[in-house]
């Protein structure tokens, strides 16, 4: 009985199409597959960012695979050929590993890259990213932001930079069509006449960095002698009601009565006959049904109800913001 052997895939490489971290891993079939013409050869691919403890593992019949990586670090990958047991009289045969690596040659010292990168997707409509210049960089240093997500033909540069002392310190993005629930890749690179500037790469999903507008149209309704219903409306914009969680802060006669988190645009409050004044504010956040994370909105304007008797339904609006 001769031992069945199979070669590893050929021409295994990591290709950077310029998508700021979304890379192609590709290969060619192994040599000498003539003996296994009736067989469907599979490939086991393992890859990770250098420094990561765990490998991602994929088994595929294809000759390519695509995924996102952190280009601030190198990437390593290995692949071998698998012959299923159907082809080899009952035992799976594996080739040796073919290995490859990829990294972007870093320019400049790490301190020159942008600091404190912060991106917020306001009301699921407007993306704004801001950063601080690298440590010790001169005023002749300028940073440029590029972004890509699946659906764009190529990486795009920021349309509207925010500047400070002539330096770009932020970006207001244009309309981003069909850009949520997928990885959003950003590169901020820089140029200076004096020294090379280190690039920075960032990846996130837009739905996870949404900061909604605060709720509006806060009202009170007397439900019974000891119950008051607080109501509000979702803010204008594209976020549907099903995506909101709310936090309410209620003050009764200048003392905090309750803080509550609710899923609907109402909250029923038990009151006493002695209550002279009732005020509440509410803020919103995208909930777990629509995102993995989010940012609380600002508090709404304060809504107060006061008078000798709350049942008189005297409504007073206070238009200063709650702090």
């Amino acid at each position: 009985d001769t031992e069945i052997k199979v070669n590893p895939p050929q021409d295994f490489e990591i290709v950077d199409p310029g998508y700021l971290g979304y890379l192609y891993l590709q290969w060619q079939p192994p040599l000498s597959l003539d003996h296994f013409k009736e067989c469907t050869v599979e490939y086991e691919l393992k890859y990770r960012n250098i420094g990561s403890e765990t490998w991602k593992t994929i088994i595929t019949k294809n000759l390519h695979y695509k995924d996102g990586f952190d280009l601030n670090k190198g990437i390593e990958a290995k692949i071998h050929t698998l012959l299923p047991w159907q082809c080899t009289n009952g035992s799976e045969v594996q080739s040796s590993w073919a290995e490859t690596t990829y990294w972007i040659s870093p320019q400049g010292i790490p301190e020159t890259k942008v600091q404190d990168m912060d991106c917020v997707y306001y009301n699921w409509q407007y993306l704004l990213c801001s950063w601080k210049p690298g440590i010790g960089v001169l005023l002749d240093t300028n940073y440029n932001l590029f972004y890509w997500y699946e659906g764009l033909d190529h990486a795009l540069q920021c349309v509207d930079y925010i500047k400070a002392d002539g330096q770009n310190i932020g970006c207001r993005f244009p309309y981003l069509e069909a850009s949520d629930y997928k990885d959003f890749y950003i590169c901020v690179n820089g140029s200076s006449e004096n020294k090379p500037i280190r690039s920075s790469y960032f990846t996130f999903q837009l739905q996870n960095i949404v900061k909604p507008l605060p709720p509006v149209y806060l009202t009170f309704t007397r439900e019974s002698s000891c119950e008051i219903k607080l109501k509000w409306s979702i803010p204008l914009g594209p976020i549907p009601a099903r995506c909101f969680d709310y936090e309410i802060e209620i003050r009764e006669d200048d003392t905090t009565l309750v803080t509550a988190t609710v899923e609907n645009e109402t909250y029923t409050l038990k009151t006493t006959n002695e209550t002279r004044q009732l005020c509440f504010v509410v803020r919103s956040k995208v909930n777990i049904y629509c995102s993995d994370d989010g940012i609380w909105s600002e508090w709404s304007d304060k809504q107060c109800w006061e008078g000798e008797d709350l049942s008189k339904k005297t409504l007073l609006r206070h238009h200063h913001h709650h702090h």
Epitope: Y122, K163, A164, G170, P174
Partner: antibody, heavy 119, light 111 residues
Framework: QVQLVQSGAEVKKPGASVKVSCKAS????????MNWVRQAPGQGLEWIGR????????DYNQNFKDRVTITRDTSASTAYMELSSLRSEDTAVYYC????????????WGQGTSVTVSS | EIVLTQSPATLSLSPGERATLSCRAS??????????MNWYQQKPGQAPRLLIY???RQGSGIPDRFSGSGSGTDFTLTISRLEPEDFAVYFC?????????FGGGTKLEIK
């Protein structure tokens, strides 16, 4: 909820200056560009300039650059447009108008401030 | 500066009809894969109201009967079925480069 409230009507003599204010509420003032646009009686719209409240960066229409000054007070969420050396052809309604970056147009406008220049 | 020319200057139509307004730029207003062309509606004594931005995207709260199209130098605002409240003046505006400029306007009047 977004509101841009402008200062009241002004009547000025030729050669004088006028300063129009625009108080913003209902949104984060520094996140949006603030534009100034004017409209002479029965005429079209003319862009004067804009300020980025985030960093104070300003772009002016060169037709006005020697006479106009746009400023902002972020703590008061207010933008200002001052026009000097007034002449009769500066008689117009002056609008402040908010826009998120150049790709979004101008989505909220103030109510307008009428400036009349007459001797 | 980029000059915008709107046509016709006046358009007389009846409610229920389709309106097609044109705006031509003296040079392309495209950049970064975006057409920096916006459309506004203005009624007497009121501030303008944003209808369309980036050539074809509807402003917030704008009825579906308003649509925009075009790229480069030629742009169109279409109102599919005119409602009585649609009779007003319409301006195009480019935001590709400073100074931002407006077209001279098209007055849409009741026939």
């Amino acid at each position: 909820q977004v509101q841009l409230v402008q200062s009241g009507a002004e009547v000025k003599k030729p050669g004088a200056s006028v300063k129009v204010s625009c108080k913003a509420s209902g949104y984060t003032f520094s996140n949006y560009l603030m534009n100034w646009v004017r409209q002479a009686p029965g005429q079209g719209l003319e862009w004067i300039g804009r300020i980025d409240p985030y960093d104070g960066d300003i772009d002016y229409n060169q037709n006005f650059k020697d006479r106009v000054t746009i400023t902002r007070d972020t703590s008061a969420s207010t933008a200002y447009m001052e026009l000097s050396s007034l002449r009769s052809e500066d008689t117009a309604v002056y609008y402040c108008a908010r826009g998120y970056g150049t790709a979004y147009g101008v989505d909220y406008w103030g109510q307008g401030t009428s400036v009349t220049v007459s001797s | 500066e980029i000059v915008l020319t709107q046509s016709p200057a006046t358009l007389s139509l009846s409610p229920g009809e389709r309106a097609t307004l044109s705006c031509r730029a003296s040079e392309s207003v495209d950049n970064y894969g975006i057409s920096f062309m916006n459309w506004y509606q203005q009624k007497p004594g009121q501030a303008p109201r944003l209808l369309i931005y980036a050539a074809s995207r509807q402003g917030s709260g704008i009825p579906d009967r308003f649509s925009g199209s075009g790229s480069g130098t030629d742009f169109t605002l279409t109102i599919s079925r005119l409602e009585p409240e649609d009779f007003a003046v319409y301006f195009c505006q480019q935001s590709k480069e400073v100074p931002w400029t407006f077209g001279g306007g098209t007055k849409l009047e009741i026939k």
